[in-house]
Amino acid sequence: MMTGTIETTGNISAKKGGSVILQCHLSSTMAQVTQVNWEQHDHSLLAIRNAELGWHIYPAFKDRVAPGPGLGLTLQSLTMNDTGEYFCTYHTYPDGTYRGRIFLEVLESSVAEHSARFQIP
């Protein structure tokens, strides 16, 4: 039975050229987190973090994506094209798969407010 819940940074905004942290947190379960996948709006893989094998960043993104903090992902040198949905997929044992969603809006404005409150989607 899947008892866990995923908390995410929800809807966030950040400034073009800046950076942003995408963060998900799995709670209320004792399951092993064996792998976390980070995917972009088109469901292409950005990165995986496997407990045993460490971080692997998809080569096309290695200059703009940094692992962490924790199981999160840091996007750097943001462009307007980075606007959209991001998904964290937690593969766990024995529970199965948990999935969280984050919506990132990249703003031209120099006063873009970066909200990073945790919320359950």
Partner: antibody, heavy 122, light 107 residues
Framework: QVQLVQSGAEVKKPGSSVKVSCKAS????????ISWVRQAPGQGLEWMGV????????NYAQKFQGRVTVTADESTSTAYMELSSLRSEDTAVYYC???????????????WGQGTTVTVSS | DIQMTQSPSSLSASVGDRVTITCRAS??????LNWYQQKPGKAPKLLIY???SLQSGVPSRFSGSGSGTDFTLTISSLQPEDFATYYC?????????FGGGTKVEIK
């Protein structure tokens, strides 16, 4: 049934390099990583490094960093491990092993190659 | 790196005996532990994953237990084909590390 088939035994001179191959027969590298583990004569198992073929990215044990390179060719479902600056202590059997990614990542190394003996001797 | 210590390093037992091998991690690894069996001249074989889950095709006389730092592999009734070397491996953090092995020999 997926099998990992490794290249044959090698005898190398100190200071040279060796490249061992590992081909997935009856399957592909999709959703898998390939780890490399070695075993010196009469000794235990020592993890060296891993590659995620769908990314082409590799991570290495610190002990081997700078001396080992792990690569993969997805089109032929073959992984390679190259070890340079060989010394006598590198004499060992080298194994490749399959690891699941994603939903089955909780499994261990569930399919192993038969091993490749590398002898380093002058 | 996390150090994995197995004990004993070798043991002698008879067919039908109950055999227990222990593995201790230098820090807590939750239940991220695998057990492998290796026979002379052969590649290792996965027996148990996630500390206590039996790999498909492995006889039920093998069982694993433990969590945190202390783990046990038990063979409830030793069979002739079980004489081999057994390794534990942590997969809690990168890099994965193995114990030194326990050789089970015929008494």
């Amino acid at each position: 049934q997926v099998q990992l088939v490794q290249s044959g035994a090698e005898v190398k001179k100190p200071g040279s390099s060796v490249k061992v191959s590992c081909k997935a027969s009856g399957g592909t590298f999709q959703n898998y990583a390939i780890s490399w583990v070695r075993q010196a004569p009469g000794q235990g198992l020592e993890w060296m490094g891993v590659i995620v073929p769908i990314f082409g990215t590799a991570n290495y044990a610190q002990k081997f960093q700078g001396r080992v390179t792990v690569t993969a060719d997805e089109s032929t479902s073959t992984a390679y491990m190259e070890l340079s600056s060989l010394r006598s202590e590198d004499t060992a059997v080298y194994y490749c092993a399959r690891l699941h990614l994603g939903q089955k990542a909780y499994y261990g190394m569930d399919v192993w190659g038969q091993g490749t003996t590398v002898t380093v001797s002058s | 790196d996390i150090q994995m210590t197995q004990s004993p390093s070798s043991l002698s037992a008879s067919v039908g005996d109950r055999v227990t091998i222990t593995c201790r991690a230098s820090q807590s690894i939750s239940s991220y532990l695998n057990w492998y069996q290796q026979k002379p001249g052969k590649a290792p074989k996965l027996l148990i994953y996630a500390a206590s889950s039996l790999q498909s095709g492995v006889p039920s006389r093998f069982s694993g237990s433990g969590s945190g730092t202390d783990f046990t592999l038990t063979i409830s009734s030793l069979q002739p084909e079980d004489f081999a070397t057994y390794y534990c491996q942590q997969r809690y953090v990168f890099p994965p590390t193995f114990g030194g092995g326990t050789k089970v020999e015929i008494k």
